[in-house]
């Protein structure tokens, strides 16, 4: 059933999530800036076709529109999306020494955000079954593909976070 802003989510949880989203957005922006400055890969829209051929997936948030938000479904999609991005970021490992530390921090912050979402779902008695394994992740055949993949994954993640932020801010409104 749809659930609006007057939901059963504690304000402390929502504020924590908003903090974490903005932290990850900052990490993601730093990764994008470094990819642009170091490799002149500045425009994700120019790499969309490559993204299709590499099989870089998108994470849906279809259960989260503010008009008909389904709380359990939305939190579950948030968690699943973060789980997906953990795998995509893992596939980028070894992208380049210059980008390594930024990617490492981004990976951990995404994992910590997934933990926060799961914790709350568990407290509400709606934690889904644990995903046993990651789905098939893109395989990058060259350094260029990995860097281009980095641009696309960062761009997809930022879009996912923008939607997440809007949903969480809507829920946090008194």
């Amino acid at each position: 059933t749809p659930l609006g802003p007057a939901s059963s989510l504690p304000q402390s949880f929502l504020l924590k999530c908003l903090e974490q989203v903005r932290k990850i957005q900052g990490d993601g922006a730093a990764l994008q800036e470094k990819l642009c400055a170091t490799y002149k890969l500045c425009h994700p829209e120019e790499l969309v076709l490559l993204g299709h051929s590499l099989g870089i997936p998108w994470a849906p948030l279809s259960s989260c529109p503010s008009q008909a938000l389904q709380l359990a479904g939305c939190l579950s999609q948030l968690h699943s999306g973060l789980f997906l991005y953990q795998g995509l970021l893992q596939a980028l490992e070894g992208i380049s020494p210059e980008l390594g530390p930024t990617l490492d921090t981004l990976q951990l912050d995404v994992a910590d955000f997934a933990t926060t979402i799961w914790q709350q779902m568990e407290e509400l008695g709606m934690a889904p079954a644990l995903q046993p394994t990651q789905g098939a992740m893109p395989a990058f055949a060259s350094a260029f593909q990995r860097r281009a993949g980095g641009v696309l994954v960062a761009s997809h993640l930022q879009s996912f976070l923008e939607v997440s932020y809007r949903v969480l801010r809507h829920l946090a409104q008194p």
Epitope: E19, F83, Q86, G87, P101, T105, L108, D112, T115, W118
Partner: antibody, heavy 119, light 112 residues
Framework: QVQLVQSGAEVKKPGASVKVSCKAS????????MHWIKQAPGQGLEWIGY????????NYNQKFRDRATLTADKSTSTAYMELSSLRSEDTAVYYC????????????WGQGTLVTVSS | DIVMTQSPLSLPVTPGEPASISCRSS???????????LYWYLQKPGQSPQLLIY???NLASGVPDRFSGSGSGTDFTLKISRVEAEDVGVYYC?????????FGQGTKLEIK
Amino acid sequence: QVQLVQSGAEVKKPGASVKVSCKASGYTFPIYTMHWIKQAPGQGLEWIGYINPSIGYANYNQKFRDRATLTADKSTSTAYMELSSLRSEDTAVYYCARGGYGDSLFAYWGQGTLVTVSS
Amino acid sequence: DIVMTQSPLSLPVTPGEPASISCRSSKSLLHSNGITYLYWYLQKPGQSPQLLIYQMSNLASGVPDRFSGSGSGTDFTLKISRVEAEDVGVYYCAQNLELPYTFGQGTKLEIK
């Protein structure tokens, strides 16, 4: 309640390897990252790295990257830290600590495992 | 890597008196999200470290309110308003803004 119980003290010869375990209970193990921290005798704390059990991904402090291996067994809710090619400066207490965000980060620690490297 | 520097390294205090420990980071720990990613831990003799303060100024669960944390982006202070015998141990500041996480060298608080 959350508990992290580590394996007992070890004495090893230089060049050998050691594997320290950290058994977690009281929470859903794969959901949280597990971090490892070194404390040499009379010294401060040094972050070694972490393992994300849900995807089996480990990340290391550059200083430990060549010799430390972090793993996790979801079926037994146990995290492991293996240190190879031991030398005298590896003599230390090694702690596992549960990750998380905000007030969750390192809110729970194992009791520590003393590893002594001596010929 | 972000370098964390604490002072003093040793702090003898009379019970009931206040105490103050400083910590400096080589890079600002204030993120654009408004959060300062600075933590304080206490390691009592023979024990594992325990979380005291998270995100610069928030008291962890179960920590007495005689402890407080403050600071700016790079300079931080842990204050104990009235030291008690149970407060002895080594205090560490730590950053978790970015990997690798790093700790200060520690400040040993002892009772005079």
